[in-house]
């Protein structure tokens, strides 16, 4: 877009925005920090929802991998009128029900979802929106929560992933802008090569995947290499090492020459999957090479 | 008290059709999705249909595709279920049940039995 | 399609025993498997979701457990009310499957 960092991984990325009375004038700082970074999410896989929530949730686009799709959400979400409630958990609720269904038919997709609100939740709505974000997590999400002004960090840690998924925003909307990047940076998760990218048939190998986000995980011991064979079967595998640039996986035997695998990571033990466009294919390699 | 409350069941001939409902009340309807659950005479729990919240996903089992169809009003809190082209494999009590996905249905109607016999 | 098996299809068992019920799919399901008991003409009841975590209001000496594959349901301290048929239902894809139950009596 701008020069500004981008993120490549293929995975569902939720928006779930607070539009209650409280932000009724600061709607455009909301705005455009949603547009900033969806535009730095530029993954052909990656797919996109907007979600907004005051006394009800609401989805404002459905997830789609469609940028024209995601152009007209982002001019719907510009035409909110803030008004109501923080009913959070209405807007968890909506998501969640999007990662089961849109995961129900067989391949299952990561999610992400970044959360923003302005105010601390009263202790009925915490309760039901730490329940309802443990609802996502137990579909497969990783959640990040956006606090802006009088939020509460210590619920906001609850319910997102950790104290180290929430982000800070003190110095009130305006200040949006300036966490762009960190953002971007922490909710990254993405495959961006394999070393050796061609491997020779029926040999075992290590395959070194470059990245980012791999520590990102709530567990890096549920961290799995996948592999999709020839599009049809996937095969998952341990690495050996977990660092946040890079993953060090056990290869699968592949028997035949011309033989492709898709390269795919996991960040719960296999539940989701973020795809990429990495892929290792096989050659013949003659004795002694 | 969280409630679900059929209705529409009865004695109808192989090739006619019938409209369950059922009027949920006590909780915000409009939050959760909806399944239909059937059990015909002696025999096990049969999935018949589900409906997410605002009916963005509607999904069937194979022996009622094509003749059965789900949907909801959320203004009006209820869950309807068409049966066209009845027969007599489809002789069942029928269920209505709220969901949260994935965690189960944790709440039921009372049942409806459904005859399809000429 | 994933079929879900239940074994045994009944047991006998007196109050006090301690009875299990096995359940499996016929491919990896994550945990998310759901308990049911059903009565003699009254509506299933949820008793665990997500093969492990009880529903509110479900005494204690119901427990579930198991991952993948392969479920079991323990019921310890059997009650006169917990003489009835049990099934377990998958919710990991579409079409949802339930298992042919199991029908629990009194020797």
């Known amino acids: 877009e701008d020069g500004g960092p981008a993120c490549y991984g293929g995975f569902d990325l939720y928006f779930i925005l607070d539009k209650s009375g409280s932000v009724l004038h600061h709607w455009n700082e909301i705005y455009y920090f949603v547009e900033q970074l969806a535009h730095r999410f530029i993954s052909p896989q990656l797919r996109m929802s907007f979600i907004v929530f005051s006394t009800r949730g609401t989805t404002l686009m459905k997830l789609t991998e469609d940028r024209e799709q995601i152009r007209q959400g982002l001019e719907e979400l510009q035409k909110v009128l803030p008004g109501g409630d923080t009913y959070m958990h209405e807007g968890f609720e909506r998501a969640s029900e999007q990662i089961y269904y849109e995961n129900s038919q067989g391949y299952r997709t990561a999610s992400v979802i970044i959360a923003l609100t302005d105010g601390e939740l009263h202790e009925d709505l915490f309760f039901y929106s730490e329940r309802e974000a443990n609802r996502s997590r137990d579909l497969g999400a990783i959640v990040y929560c956006v606090g802006v002004k009088d939020f509460n960090e210590t619920q906001l840690a609850r319910i997102a992933d950790s104290k180290d998924h929430v982000f800070p925003v003190n110095d009130g909307f305006q200040a949006l802008q300036g966490i762009i990047h960190s953002i971007l940076k922490k909710s990254c998760i993405e495959i961006l090569a394999a070393e050796p990218s061609t491997i020779c048939a029926g040999e075992s190998f290590q395959v070194v995947v470059r990245g980012n986000g791999f520590r990102h995980a709530r567990n890096v011991d549920r961290v799995l290499c996948s592999f999709k064979i020839n599009d049809s079967v996937t095969l998952n595998e341990k690495p050996f090492a977990v660092e946040d640039t890079y993953l060090l996986c056990p290869a699968p035997i592949l028997k035949e020459v011309g033989m492709k695998a898709a390269l795919q990571v996991s960040m719960n033990d296999g539940l989701s999957f973020i795809s990429s466009s990495v892929i290792i294919t096989t050659t013949h390699c003659s004795d002694g090479s | 008290e969280v409630q679900l409350v059929q209705s529409g069941g009865g004695l109808v001939k192989p090739g006619g059709s019938l409209r369950l409902s059922c009027a949920a009340s006590?909780?915000?309807?409009?939050?959760?999705?909806m399944n239909w659950v059937r059990q015909a005479p002696g025999k096990g729990l049969e999935w018949v249909s589900s409906i997410s919240s605002s009916s963005s996903y509607i999904y069937y089992a194979d022996s009622v595709k094509g003749r059965f169809t789900i949907s909801r009003d959320n203004a009006k809190n209820s869950l309807y279920l068409q049966m066209n082209s009845l027969r007599a494999e489809d002789t069942a009590v029928y269920y209505c049940a709220r969901v949260r996905p994935p965690y189960g249905m944790d709440v039921w109607g009372q049942g409806t039995l459904v005859t399809v016999s000429s | 399609n994933i079929q879900m098996t239940q074994s045994p299809s009944s047991v006998s068992a007196s109050v006090g025993d301690t009875v299990t019920i096995s359940c499996r799919a016929s491919q990896g399901i994550s945990n998310w498997l759901g308990w049911y008991q059903q009565r003699p003409g009254e509506a299933p009841k949820l008793l665990i979701y997500a093969a492990s975590h009880l529903q509110s209001g479900v005494p204690s000496r119901f427990s579930g457990s198991g991952s993948g594959t392969d479920f079991v349901l323990t019921i310890t301290s059997l009650q006169p009310e917990d003489f009835a048929t049990y099934y377990c239902q998958q919710s990991n894809s579409f079409p949802l499957a339930f298992g042919g139950g199991t029908k629990l009596e009194i020797k």
């Open positions: 006590g909780f915000t309807f409009s939050s959760y999705s």
